[in-house]
C-alpha cells in the first residue's frame, strides 16, 4: 500500500481548509456538507459539541456557547491588549487563568473552560476527519499554517493544538509562504520573479513579498494587519442596516444578540453576492419584535461603507515594499489570496496602486494557503513528484530576535524577515567588575527598548571567573529551526561553560502534562461526539423511515392494493413513532433503533406484500428487505433436481 499522505491545513481565523498532495496534484477536500472551507467554529450545547458548519449554523440560537476567533487568542496572554480589545466583541466569555485566556462555556449542563489551543485542536480534529473521510485511512502528519505576524508563542501554541488533535505537526509555515508555494508550482523555471502576495481573509491581512527562482522561494518581507478582514466588512454592513432599521421602524436592534447575529449572517451573504452582482437583497423574516426586514444594498454603497478599510490595505503593501527595498515597478506578479480579495474594489485599488498591472487570480483565493501547505507536507514526507521535488522553501522570521543589553537596550541578533532556518552568533561581555554571571533575556520585536518588545524567555549563565568589566567573552548564539522555534545558547569562552534555552514560552504556554491531558480530553470528546453522531443518525433513520412509510401507504397509487386494516395499522404505528420522536428528540441510540425495528416489524411485511410479484423491489428508501431465513439468514435460492 502507498504510504499515508500528509495533509496541509490552513487554520484560519474564520474558516479553515485542508488539502492533500497525491497523484501529482493537490486536492482541496470538501467537508460532509460539500464545502471546501469549514468554519473555524466550535459550539457547545446541552447535548453535544458541534464543529464547523453545524456550529456556525446554530450560532444565532446559542451565541454564548459558540466559540470562534480562537486564533485571535492562541498563544496570547490574557492581559494582551489585543485580547482585551477583542473580548468586547465576542458573545462568549473569556476568563483569566494565570494570565492565560480561557473560553468559558456551558456544555451538557456544566460550566467548562477551554484553552484556545483546545478550541483550535477541535477545529484541527475536524479538518483531520475531513481528510480521513476522503482518503479512507487515518492521517497523522500535517503542515499547519499561521499568519506571518504570529510570534513564537503563537506558533508554539498552534503546534500544541495540532498535538492535542492527534497530529504530528511536520512544520508550522506562514500563510503567505504557503500561498507562494501554491503559486510557484505553476510558475517554476521562469527566471527570478518578485511576487507580492496580498492575503485578505476573514480575520487577518498579510502582505508578503517573495522572490521565486527556479522553484526556490525566499520571503523578502512581510507586513499586514492582524485585525483586518472580511468580518470587518460584515460589521460595516451590520451597522449600516442597524441604522436603517432604526430609521424605518424606530427600533434599535443592536442590543438583541440573536437579531444582530441573524442580520450578520444575511450581511455576509450579501457581501459575497456583491462581488459578482451590483446589488444584493436581504430578506429576514421576523428580525425583531415580529418585524420582517426586507431591504437591499448596492455595490457602490458597500464600497462607500468600507472605503477607509479598503484603502488601508495599501499601507502594509507600501511597508512591505520598503522592507524588501523594492520599488513597485520591480514586482512581477501580484497574487490574490483570501476570500475578501474577490471584492472588486479591493482588486481595483491594488491594481491602480501598481499602475494597472494585471492581478493573478488563477488560484482560488480561499484555497491557496491549504494548497501550498499540502505541497509542503508532501515535500517534508519525501514526495518524489517532479512537481515538488525541486521546490525549496525559505521562510522568514516575522520579528527581530535579540537580547537585552545594558540600559534595557534591544540588541537584535536576527533581524526580522531574515530567511530561516538561521543561526547568528555575537560576543557580549560583562557590565560590572567581577560579575559572576549574566542574565540572558530574549526578546522579539522592532522597538529600540526591550520594555516595548515581547519577552520570550530568560536564563542565567553563572560561574564566570572574576574579571574586570569588559574582559569576559560571552558568546551568544541564536538558532532558529525551520519551524521558527528558537534556541539560544550562551558560552563563557574562558571556561567553556554554557547554558541554553529553547524558547517555548513556558510562561505563556501549556505544559507537557496539560497538553497530554488535553490530548486525552480530545479523545474523550471525540468518543462523545461519535456517540452523538450515532444517536443522531439513528434518530434520522427512524424519522425518515416513519415518514417514508406514512407517505407510501397514503400514496393514491396504492388504492385498492392495500387493505384499510393494513393501512390503518401502518399509519397508527407511524403516528405513534412520529409523535414519540417529537417528544423524545434526546432519546438514546438504542431507543431510536428499537422504535425503528418495531416500526419495520409492522410495516415491512405489509409493504413487501404490495411489491411481491410486481417485478421489482419496494419503493426506494424503505429498507423493506424480505424475511431472512436460517439462523437469521436462510436459503435465497433453491437447487432444482
Amino acid at each position: 500500500m502507498a504510504k499515508a499522505a500528509a495533509i496541509g491545513i490552513d487554520l484560519g481565523t474564520t474558516y479553515s481548509c485542508v488539502g492533500v498532495f497525491q497523484h501529482g496534484k493537490v486536492e482541496i477536500i470538501a467537508n460532509d456538507q460539500g464545502n471546501r472551507t469549514t468554519p473555524s467554529y466550535v459550539a457547545f450545547t446541552d447535548t453535544e459539541r458541534l464543529i464547523g458548519d453545524a456550529a456556525k449554523n446554530q450560532v444565532a440560537l446559542n451565541p454564548q456557547n459558540t466559540v470562534f476567533d480562537a486564533k485571535r487568542l492562541i498563544g496570547r496572554k490574557f492581559g494582551d491588549p489585543v485580547v482585551q480589545s477583542d473580548m468586547k466583541h465576542w458573545p462568549f466569555q473569556v476568563i483569566n487563568d494565570g494570565d492565560k485566556p480561557k473560553v468559558q462555556v456551558s456544555y451538557k449542563g456544566e460550566t467548562k473552560a477551554f484553552y484556545p489551543e483546545e478550541i483550535s485542536s477541535m477545529v484541527l480534529t475536524k479538518m483531520k476527519e475531513i481528510a480521513e473521510a476522503y482518503l479512507g485511512y487515518p492521517v497523522t502528519n500535517a503542515v499547519i499554517t499561521v499568519p506571518a505576524y504570529f510570534n513564537d508563542s503563537q506558533r508554539q501554541a498552534t503546534k500544541d493544538a495540532g498535538v492535542i488533535a492527534g497530529l504530528n505537526v511536520l512544520r508550522i509555515i506562514n500563510e503567505p509562504t504557503a500561498a507562494a508555494i501554491a503559486y510557484g508550482l505553476d510558475r517554476t523555471g521562469k527566471g527570478e520573479r518578485n511576487v507580492l502576495i496580498f492575503d485578505l481573509g476573514g480575520g487577518t491581512f498579510d502582505v508578503s513579498i517573495l522572490t521565486i527562482d527556479d522553484g526556490i522561494f525566499e520571503v523578502k518581507a512581510t507586513a499586514g494587519d492582524t485585525h483586518l478582514g472580511g468580518e470587518d466588512f460584515d460589521n460595516r454592513l451590520v451597522n449600516h442596516f442597524v441604522e436603517e432599521f432604526k430609521r424605518k421602524h424606530k427600533k434599535d436592534i443592536s442590543q438583541n444578540k440573536r437579531a444582530v447575529r441573524r442580520l450578520r449572517t444575511a450581511c455576509e451573504r450579501a457581501k459575497r453576492t456583491l462581488s459578482s452582482s451590483t446589488q444584493a437583497s436581504l430578506e429576514i423574516d421576523s428580525l425583531f419584535e415580529g418585524i420582517d426586514f426586507y431591504t437591499s444594498i448596492t455595490r457602490a454603497r458597500f464600497e462607500e461603507l468600507c472605503s477607509d478599510l479598503f484603502r488601508s490595505t495599501l499601507e502594509p503593501v507600501e511597508k512591505a515594499l520598503r522592507d524588501a527595498k523594492l520599488d513597485k515597478a520591480q514586482i512581477h506578479d501580484l497574487v490574490l489570496v483570501g476570500g475578501s480579495t474577490r471584492i472588486p474594489k479591493v482588486q481595483k485599488l491594488l491594481q491602480d496602486f501598481f499602475n494597472g498591472r494585471d492581478l493573478n487570480k488563477s488560484i482560488n483565493p480561499d484555497e491557496a494557503v491549504a494548497y501550498g501547505a499540502a505541497v509542503q507536507a508532501a515535500i517534508l514526507m519525501g514526495d518524489k513528484s517532479e512537481n515538488v521535488q525541486d521546490l525549496l522553501l525559505l521562510d522568514v522570521a516575522p520579528l527581530s530576535l535579540g537580547l537585552e543589553t545594558a540600559g534595557g537596550v534591544m540588541t537584535a541578533l536576527i533581524k526580522r524577515n531574515s530567511t530561516i532556518p538561521t543561526k547568528q552568533t555575537q560576543i557580549f561581555t560583562t557590565y560590572s567588575d567581577n560579575q559572576p554571571g549574566v542574565l540572558i533575556q530574549v526578546y522579539e520585536g522592532e522597538r529600540a527598548m526591550t520594555k516595548d518588545n515581547n519577552l520570550l524567555g530568560r536564563f542565567e549563565l553563572s560561574g564566570i571567573p572574576p574579571a574586570p568589566r569588559g574582559v569576559p567573552q560571552i558568546e551568544v548564539t541564536f538558532d532558529i529551526d525551520a519551524n521558527g522555534i528558537l534556541n539560544v545558547t550562551a558560552t563563557d569562552k574562558s571556561t567553556g561553560k554554557a547554558n541554553k534555552i529553547t524558547i517555548t514560552n513556558d510562561k505563556g504556554r501549556l505544559s507537557k502534562e496539560e497538553i497530554e491531558r488535553m490530548v486525552q480530553e480530545a479523545e474523550k470528546y471525540k468518543a462523545e461526539d461519535e456517540v452523538q453522531r450515532e444517536r443522531v443518525s439513528a434518530k434520522n433513520a427512524l424519522e425518515s423511515y416513519a415518514f417514508n412509510m406514512k407517505s407510501a401507504v397514503e400514496d393514491e397509487g396504492l388504492k385498492g392494493k392495500i387493505s384499510e386494516a393494513d393501512k390503518k395499522k401502518v399509519l397508527d404505528k407511524c403516528q405513534e413513532v412520529i409523535s414519540w420522536l417529537d417528544a423524545n428528540t434526546l432519546a438514546e441510540k438504542d431507543e431510536f433503533e428499537h422504535k425503528r425495528k418495531e416500526l419495520e416489524q409492522v410495516c415491512n411485511p405489509i409493504i413487501s406484500g404490495l411489491y411481491q410479484g410486481a417485478g421489482g423491489p419496494g419503493p426506494g428508501g424503505f429498507g423493506a428487505q424480505g424475511p431472512k431465513g436460517g439462523s437469521g439468514s436462510g436459503p435465497t435460492i433453491e437447487e432444482v433436481d
Partner: antibody, heavy 116, light 112 residues
Framework: QIQLVQSGVEVKKPGASVKVSCKAS????????MNWVRQAPGQGLEWMGW????????TYADDFKGRFTFTTDTSTSTAYMEVRSLRSDDTAVYFC?????????WGQGTLVTVSS | EIVLTQSPDSLAVSLGERATINCKSS????????????LAWYQQKAGQSPKLLIY???TRESGVPDRFSGSGSGTDFTLSIDSLQAEDVAVYYC????????FGGGTKVEIK
C-alpha cells in the same frame, strides 16, 4: 390456534452455552416480533430484548448485551435464544413472547439451571 | 431507562371485594399523537406463563373478563379487579412500551 412451544429443561455447567428454541405456529411468523423474558427463581419478569423476525435485527436490554444472542429460522418459524459463558445467576425460566400491541402470546417457558 | 414501581408488593382481598394495584412510572408514558399511554398489565399464575390482560392502559385483551379494568395517564396507573374471584390469585405485572420495554416488580394478590 396461535401457539409458542419452547424446548425443554436444560441443566448446564458454568462456562457452557445453552440455546433455547421457540417454535411458532398459527400465524405468519415474520409479521410479529419475538421477545424474550427471563424470570429468576422467586423473582419478577425481566425483559431481555427482542428480534425483528422480518429483518433479523435485534435489540437487547442493557443487562443482556454481550453473552446473549437472538436468532430466527424463518423456514421453520422458530426463534432461538442463546446464552454463552453461563453463570449461576443465569439460572431462570426463559420465556419467548410474540409482540403485537403487547406481548399477547407466550411460550410455556424453559427452565435453564446452571450448576457445577 | 424507564423504571416502573408497583405498589403494594402484595395484597390480600376478600372474595368479591375490589383489588387495586398501582404502577408508577419514572417518566410519562403518554403519546400525544396517538393519545395513548403505553402501559400494559399481565397476570401470572403460579407455575404458568404470564398472560396479557390489558394494553394501552385500558384496552382489555380479548377473552379477559370485564371485572379487570385499567386506568391512569402520564406516570400513574391502576389495575382494578372489581369482584375478586378465586382464579384471580396471581402475581400482576405492569409493563411499559413507551420506549424499549420494562416490567414493574410485580404485586402478589391473595385471598383474605
Amino acid at each position: 390456534q396461535i401457539q409458542l412451544v419452547q424446548s425443554g429443561v436444560e441443566v448446564k455447567k458454568p462456562g457452557a452455552s445453552v440455546k433455547v428454541s421457540c417454535k411458532a405456529s398459527g400465524y405468519t411468523f415474520t409479521n410479529y416480533g419475538m421477545n424474550w423474558v427471563r424470570q429468576a427463581p422467586g423473582q419478577g419478569l425481566e425483559w431481555m430484548g427482542w428480534i425483528n423476525t422480518y429483518t433479523g435485527e435485534t435489540t437487547y436490554a442493557d443487562d443482556f448485551k454481550g453473552r446473549f444472542t437472538f436468532t430466527t429460522d424463518t423456514s421453520t418459524s422458530t426463534a432461538y435464544m442463546e446464552v454463552r459463558s453461563l453463570r449461576s445467576d443465569d439460572t431462570a425460566v426463559y420465556f419467548c413472547a410474540r409482540y403485537d400491541h403487547a406481548m399477547d402470546y407466550w411460550g410455556q417457558g424453559t427452565l435453564v439451571t446452571v450448576s457445577s | 431507562e424507564i423504571v416502573l414501581t408497583q405498589s403494594p408488593d402484595s395484597l390480600a382481598v376478600s372474595l368479591g371485594e375490589r383489588a387495586t394495584i398501582n404502577c408508577k412510572s419514572s417518566q410519562s408514558l403518554f403519546n400525544s399523537g396517538t393519545r395513548k399511554n403505553y402501559l400494559a398489565w399481565y397476570q401470572q399464575k403460579a407455575g404458568q406463563s404470564p398472560k396479557l390482560l390489558i394494553y394501552w392502559t385500558s384496552t382489555r385483551e380479548s377473552g379477559v373478563p370485564d371485572r379487570f379494568s385499567g386506568s391512569g395517564s402520564g406516570t400513574d396507573f391502576t389495575l382494578s379487579i372489581d369482584s375478586l374471584q378465586a382464579e384471580d390469585v396471581a402475581v400482576y405485572y405492569c409493563k411499559q412500551s413507551y420506549t424499549l420495554y420494562t416490567f414493574g416488580g410485580g404485586t402478589k394478590v391473595e385471598i383474605k
